[in-house]
């Protein structure tokens, strides 16, 4: 399964025209229309922590 190009969506509430800015440890969750705590990943092949890259199986920092 190849990597897909991410379709970047506006970080806006469906009932608001004001974009939501989140701090570094957060990201925008469209479901709750707000900034939430966001985890980074360790990729299995490198062990590096990064933002999510499409098309890869990933290992969260905090084990499940």
């Amino acid at each position: 399964m190849g990597a897909r190009r991410l379709r970047v969506r506006s970080q806006r509430s469906r009932d608001s025209s004001v974009p939501t800015q989140c701090n570094q440890t957060e990201c925008f969750d469209p479901l709750v229309r707000n900034c939430v705590s966001c985890e980074l990943f360790h990729t299995p092949d490198t062990g590096h922590t990064s933002s999510l890259e499409p098309g890869t199986a990933l290992q969260p920092q905090e084990g499940s």
Epitope: L6, R9, Q11, V36, S37, P60
Partner: antibody, heavy 125, light 107 residues
Framework: EVQLVESGGGLVQPGGSLRLSCAAS????????IHWVRQAPGKGLEWVAW????????DYADSVKGRFTISADTSKNTAYLQMNSLRAEDTAVYYC??????????????????WGQGTLVTVSS | DIQMTQSPSSLSASVGDRVTITCRAS??????VAWYQQKPGKAPKLLIF???FLFSGVPSRFSGSGSGTDFTLTISSLQPEDFATYYC?????????FGQGTKVEIK
Amino acid sequence: EVQLVESGGGLVQPGGSLRLSCAASGFTISSSSIHWVRQAPGKGLEWVAWVLPSVGFTDYADSVKGRFTISADTSKNTAYLQMNSLRAEDTAVYYCARRVCYNRLGVCAGGMDYWGQGTLVTVSS
Amino acid sequence: DIQMTQSPSSLSASVGDRVTITCRASEDISSSVAWYQQKPGKAPKLLIFSASFLFSGVPSRFSGSGSGTDFTLTISSLQPEDFATYYCQQSEVSPPTFGQGTKVEIK
């Protein structure tokens, strides 16, 4: 270790009330959204409500709106579901779950990664 | 509300088979789909999130694909422990809605 433990289920008559609790450990509920999902006997999953404790945002399924209230006490790291005016069709196992978010270019990519064991609510006369 | 239509509702398969389950959203939900596995009497388990990302600890025989309105969960080689019910769920907009489920049974 992340854990969610529900309690408060039981047998109640139609029109009655119950309060379910979801005690979290291993993470802080204020950093995530907490969801209640139910499953009637032999049926599929039905989302009920969510709360974002950090700001108090909530939302509800149409089937429970006006009857159920979701809340959270961050000092107790616990979420609640107050269920009033219960009906036979509310009979189900009720699960609480945490929504995890991973950073996908500033936007949440996630799902419900931890679930409680479930608590059975039976509405019957 | 966004409707998630899963198909088939049930299927019979043998160990080693390739199994595909589809989920169709009533409107564009980008890639905001998760897939869950549930066994009788147990809570659901997260398999795939954001349409194609394998959750931690999930075997690589599970994969997900799709975007927009059409999504697929594939089990490349069915194992005995994979006989269960599978659900898709959208989280693009509240309320988050589940598909009706697909029961994978032993042939």
